[in-house]
Interface confidence: low
């Protein structure tokens, strides 16, 4: 069952799934000037059996110079459901990954892929949050969100995370409720991860014992 909406937005934070549940779809998006090959699948699908999970289909992009359009090809509406968006660097390094039963790892980059990866998460998916550069967590319970099914509807649990910094006033835990989303951001606003060179964060995710190392900058 696909999740109906996006994970919650946390001010000055980004989220990342470190493993993807079977049933997760990843759109085969190409960067400007390239398109998905004519016979190529519109998405990759995390599938598997009891002992192994992997991504079905391979995304392939080809130059669209021979055509009079640079329009990106995306899944048809019936394939699309709600778009799950997280922008990330294509050269994200994954270290010391642990294979989780029923989960796929982060797919490797494909040639000429778009900078934005659009996932379609499924019920049971967990995403992990961390504060972006220059901000830090002050009030913390679990810094994660899980897509759950309740009364036939999907919802994401609220991560208990407040990121403060850049001379913003701080509150002692208990004085202020965690902020659920950035003020004034529309629901379609995406959490962005883009490359920077001088800041490395290593996040240890206790729930999965998987470490992912990447560089971030909030835009």
């Amino acid at each position: 069952e696909l999740c109906d909406d996006d994970p919650p937005k946390i001010t000055h934070a980004t989220f990342k799934a470190v493993a993807y549940k079977e049933g997760t779809m990843l759109n085969c998006e190409c960067k400007r000037g390239f398109r998905r090959i004519k016979s190529g699948s519109p998405y990759m699908l995390c599938t598997g059996n009891s002992s192994h999970s992997s991504w079905d289909n391979q995304c392939q992009c080809t130059s669209s110079a021979a055509r009079n359009t640079t329009k990106q090809v995306t899944p048809q509406p019936e394939e699309q459901k709600e778009r799950k968006t997280t922008e990330m660097q294509s050269q994200m390094q994954l270290a010391d990954q642990v294979s989780l039963p029923g989960h796929c790892r982060e797919p490797p980059p494909w040639e000429n892929e778009a900078t934005e990866r659009i996932y379609h998460f499924v019920v049971g998916q967990t995403v992990y949050y961390q504060c972006v550069q220059g901000y830090r967590a002050l009030h913390r319970g679990p810094a994660e969100s899980v897509c759950k099914m309740t009364h036939g509807k999907t919802r994401w649990t609220q991560p208990q995370l407040i990121c403060t910094g850049e001379t913003e006033p701080s509150q002692f835990p208990g004085e202020e409720e965690p902020q659920a989303s950035p003020d004034g951001l529309p629901e379609s606003e995406t959490s962005r991860l883009v490359t920077t060179t001088d800041f490395r964060i290593q996040t240890e995710v206790a729930a999965t014992m998987e470490t992912f190392i990447f560089t971030t900058e909030y835009q």
Partner: antibody, heavy 121, light 106 residues
Amino acid sequence: QVQLQESGPGLVKPSETLSLTCTVSGGSIRSYYWSWIRQPPGKGLEWIGYIYYSGSTNYNPSLKSRVTISVDTSKNQFSLKLSSVTAADTAVYYCARDILTGYSDWFFDLWGRGTLVTVSS
Amino acid sequence: EIVMTQSPATLSVSPGERATLSCRASQSVSSNLAWYQQKPGQAPRLLIYGASTRATGIPARFSGSGSGTEFTLTISSLQSEDFAVYYCQQYNNWITFGQGTRLEIK
């Protein structure tokens, strides 16, 4: 090898302002948080506050009204000012480097040797 | 504010023996806990973070365990240089330290 060194007067009069500086040598003050922590004689540790090289600060709420921490990146230094001191502020004051590892990021892997500040008239 | 309580206040153990120090949080701090060692006249030294991960350069005889509200620091075979004061510190909600456990030679 990064080292931290606290400096400042060892004796401050009651009601005056305590001022200390921490010099970071052997590395850049950028990309880490930097904290002040104190330890009254024979007692435990108390976190005072931190600063990021950008100037972002946060302070212990119990001391917030009296504390100012600032940074001078050109000198690789950060400073503590604690106003309206009393005898209860007598302590060894440490500066410390604050580990930065995503959201599990608030412990101290590098400390200065500490400087004793006595508040007395 | 989360209150960290360490026990015992003083622990007497012979060299070569095992020492077990306890730290209790007034509410859950998940695994956001660190341990420090402090010798007289010196600054604290980070031993353990994330409740169980040894810091760089810390001997394997030091180990941490626990999560939630109950934590333990174990020194498997005490060396002479291990006798010191040990502090736990939570970093789940801001920062608070325990009052310390003095480990002395029996």
